[in-house]
């Protein structure tokens, strides 16, 4: 077959080819930020000629044109300046209201490099209607100016702009408009990952919150867990594998879907995941009817086995057939469970469609969506039971109208997005499911996104201050209890002056709490073995502090998961009959277990906990410490089996002031405290200028650094004695 000509350069931009110069290859243009390619793409036809999708006239030279944002068509009850036909990137538009009207939304908006306005639609409202004035987004025209219960407003976009959101909205009895705000956008515009992740995440969290009724009950935790177990989510992942998707992009689709699966399984809900790849025909790789769809590893391995070449013979984009296979799956499950049963009716369904273009065969995908809505009986009362997310990737031939038609429309939420490329998709899926926004006491959740603050990454982390100076660290293990080291409290029992500083989203300095009571392990006595020549002994170096008030859960304050509790069992996604031994075997399962602690400056530092034979050689070094242990004969007199050991090779060593802080591991996007920092042979902070300076021990140091942490698996009786009514412990 003839190849297509290579004179396809774009001035000021670059291009990529999905399958070289061969027929069927898609050429995609890209331009620097603030410019867009015209045309966006070309397809190599079997005749050896390039064709521009949607173009009627012959091939024109590809150019990078400046991005512009749409102008307001009308602005009610106020004025806007400057008045232009469209606005350049970086250009501003300002809004003011007439007397008697109050401005809601953004008074000044700036045109962003993706052709989208920042901020929110400006509305001049006098509060007269049953519903607030829904406003008119930039570039839109609205018909309907009554805002009473039952009144409808309709929107259309001016000139060649595309409408996303709801073209018709109704004022509902609760004073909220149905659907989602319509936005008029340039056909070439796309969404930035940093906008999509929170929008997608908010919507998803709403759905997961509804699936996980823990937030709605004030009953005992045992009851709470039963309720949690009754929530069920079916997640359907639809991956476009058509000709225009390159193999590399398909890999990123798969990777992004894996991230999503991984993240969704970290929620404490029951979830079944279906995987469907599609081109001209759909291929079901995992069905929700298969028991394996509830098993994260099985789902991920079926994703990994998804093969780009599976769809070699049919390379069109049949979105209808893909959605129809979801419908058929739902139909089978309904017949299996019984249409009238709670088991069927209480399942929530989320469909995520990852595509790079418009459907070009098989009929309108909207028909399949209508069938799905019908079988799930989606009406105003059951609106929460279905969410369809339509994500277009590659801004080239993506059909905004179609995506918008497929995506769900819910107030304050967005379900249809177009991203510039698969890298952006990956970023979105990395950050969208930020469980840390949940307000209940779900444990072990840290915000892992790149722009999160240190406190958001480790929201359990607290600082303990005897008077003014910080002394020790600790970890929230519930909304009122902190776990720390006993050796921090050496002034007898007067804790009236002590404070615990807990993370607070409203203040970078955190919030101070008084201590209601301190429970210090009675077994702790630093001088216990002085007569054996052991000048300091840290056995039982553990304490609990009950704060004077409960901590309000937030992105900055949330407990860590304690192993051997039901809470941790849920987070580990272990079966109900699991024991404390099972948790230890799962978490401390290697000779060298990667773990972390939090530094004085709040950053997360890495260590390796040595287990088994390696624990013995890690601890042996203590015999070289002649000042603290002048005539030590048996290392186990000092390093009992209560301690975990780290500090070999590239490990960071904790400073004295980091004592009491959690030693924790990450599993399934959740964090589990296995130890607490107790004592060590080297202090990297000693005499430093400030909290950001740490000194590595010289290689020649004798003894070399070693750090010892109280092993929480060895402190179970004491923890159970004092936290029995705070946490739900598993059998030993």
């Amino acid at each position: 077959a003839p190849s297509c000509p290579q004179n396809v350069n774009i001035s000021g931009g670059t291009f990529t080819l999905s399958h070289g110069w061969a027929p069927g290859s898609l050429l995609t243009y890209s331009c620097p930020q603030g410019l867009y390619p015209s045309p966006a793409s070309r397809l190599c036809k079997s005749s050896g000629q390039w064709q521009t999708p949607g173009a009627t006239r012959s091939l024109s030279k590809a150019v990078c044109k400046p991005v512009r944002c749409p102008a307001p068509v009308s602005f009610e009850n106020g004025i806007y300046t400057p008045r232009l036909g469209s606005y350049p990137v970086g250009g501003n538009v300002s809004f003011e209201c007439e007397d008697g009207f109050i401005l809601r939304g953004s008074p000044v908006r700036q045109c962003r490099p993706n052709g989208m306005w920042d901020g929110e639609t400006a509305v001049c409202d006098n509060g007269a209607g049953h519903c607030p004035n829904p406003g008119i987004s930039l570039g839109a025209v609205r018909t309907g100016f009554r805002f009473g219960h039952g009144d409808k407003v309709r929107y259309r976009c001016s000139s060649n702009l595309v409408l996303t959101g709801s073209s018709e909205r109704e004022c509902q009895g609760n004073g909220v408009w149905s659907g989602t705000e319509p936005i008029c956008r340039q056909p070439y515009s796309y969404d930035f990952p940093e906008d999509v992740a929170p929008a997608l995440g908010t919507s998803f969290s709403h759905m997961l919150g509804a699936t996980n009724p823990t937030q709605k009950t004030k009953e005992s935790l045992g009851r709470k867990i039963q309720i949690q177990r009754s929530g069920h989510l079916n997640l359907y992942l639809l991956l476009d594998c058509s000709q225009s998707v390159s193999e590399n992009d398909f890999l990123i689709f798969k990777e992004s879907a894996s991230l999503m699966v991984d993240r969704i399984f970290s929620f404490e809900i029951n979830v079944s995941v279906a995987i469907i790849t599609f081109a001209s025909e759909p291929k079901v790789l995992m069905s929700v009817l298969n028991d394996n769809s509830r098993d994260m590893t099985e789902v991920i391995s079926s994703l990994e086995n998804a093969n780009y070449k599976d769809h070699e013979n049919g390379t069109g984009t049949n979105t209808y057939a893909a959605l129809n296979s979801v419908y058929l799956m739902m139909n089978n499950q309904m017949r299996l469970l019984g249409m009238e049963t709670m088991a069927w009716q209480e399942i929530r369904h989320a469909i995520i469609l990852l595509t790079d273009g418009k459907s070009n065969m098989g009929g309108s995908p909207k028909t399949a969506v209508d069938h799905i809505r019908e079988i799930l009986n989606i009406n105003q009362k059951r609106n929460d039971y279905l969410d369809i997310y339509a994500i277009g990737v590659g801004k080239l031939d993506v059909d905004w109208r179609e995506l918008n038609e497929l995506g769900s429309k819910k107030d304050g939420e967005r379900h249809a997005f177009i991203l510039q490329d698969t890298k952006a998709l990956h970023q979105v899926f990395e950050h969208m499911l930020d469980v840390s926004k949940l307000t209940d006491t779900i444990c072990g959740v840290g915000n892992m996104s790149a722009n999160a603050s240190d406190q958001e990454r480790t929201p359990w982390h607290v600082t303990i201050k005897p008077k003014s100076q910080e002394t020790c660290r600790g970890a929230l293990i519930s909304d009122q209890w902190v776990l720390t080291a006993a050796h921090c409290f050496r002034d007898g029992n007067d804790h009236s002056l002590w404070r615990v500083n807990v993370g607070d989203p409203k203040s970078q300095w955190g919030k101070e709490f008084l201590i209601e009571k301190a429970v210090i392990s009675p077994g702790f006595d630093v001088f216990a073995k002085k007569n054996q020549g052991i000048l300091e002994f840290y056995g039982d170096d553990i304490a609990l502090l009950k704060l004077a008030q409960k901590v309000k859960m937030s992105t900055h304050a949330r407990p860590i998961c304690l192993p051997c509790t039901m809470e941790a069992n849920l987070a580990l996604r272990r079966p109900q009959g699991s024991t404390c031994r099972d948790h230890e075997n799962e978490l401390l399962n290697k000779q060298s277990v990667p773990a972390h602690f939090v530094a004085l400056n709040g950053s997360k530092l890495n260590i390796n906990l040595k287990m088994g034979v390696e624990w013995t050689s890690c601890a042996e070094v203590v015999s070289q410490e002649k000042t603290m242990f002048p005539n030590l004969t048996d290392v186990r007199e000092v390093v009992t089996d209560q301690f975990l050991c780290s500090g070999t090779q590239e490990d960071e060593s904790p400073c004295k002031g980091e004592s009491g802080g959690a030693v924790f591991l990450e599993r399934r996007f959740r964090f589990f405290q296995v130890g607490l920092v107790s004592w060590g042979l080297y202090n990297p902070c000693l005499g430093s200028a400030d909290k950001n300076s740490r000194k590595r021990a010289p290689r020649s140091k004798v003894p070399p650094p070693r750090d010892f942490h109280i092993n929480l698996f060895r402190m179970q009786p004491w923890l159970r004695q004092h936290l029995g009514d705070v946490l739900n412990f598993l059998p030993l």
Epitope: Q469, T471, R490, V526, E536, C655, A689, K691
Partner: nanobody, 122 residues
Framework: QVQLQESGGGLVQPGGSLRLSCSAS????????MGWFRQAPGKEREFVAS????????EYADSVKGRFTISRDNSKNTLYLQMNSLRAEDTAVYYC???????????????WGQGTLVTVSS
């Protein structure tokens, strides 16, 4: 907060010895890590030695290891620094410091003495 007062500084020949003392007022002396710092003219204040609140563990700057010994007497609320084999580069004002955590971060220390001058010269 602990109040601290150093003494024992003076002029000494290279190779000689001195013993610095630091007396602390406040009943909480026994719960503090104690340390010595020094500052030579035109230089930054630097860590010299520290001792844990128990007296069981000590740390020294590499430059003084083997020559200086830190000790404490909790019954007398006093900290000591025995300095042997003194060198010209040990000339500085010596300060004693108290720190509850034991890290002795310069930015966080709020209990310092006034300092005592040690001059090593022939």
């Amino acid at each position: 907060q602990v109040q601290l007062q150093e003494s024992g500084g003076g002029l000494v020949q290279p190779g000689g010895s001195l013993r610095l003392s630091c007396s602390a007022s406040g009943h909480t002396f026994r719960s503090y890590y104690m340390g010595w710092f020094r500052q030579a003219p035109g230089k930054e204040r630097e860590f010299v030695a520290s001792i844990s609140w128990t007296g069981g563990s000590t740390e020294y700057a590499d430059s003084v290891k083997g020559r200086f010994t830190i000790s404490r007497d909790n019954s007398k609320n006093t900290l000591y620094l025995q300095m042997n084999s003194l060198r010209a580069e040990d000339t500085a004002v010596y300060y004693c410091a108290a720190d509850y955590s034991g890290d002795f971060l310069l930015s966080d220390l709020d209990s310092w003495g006034q300092g005592t001058l040690v001059t090593v010269s022939s």
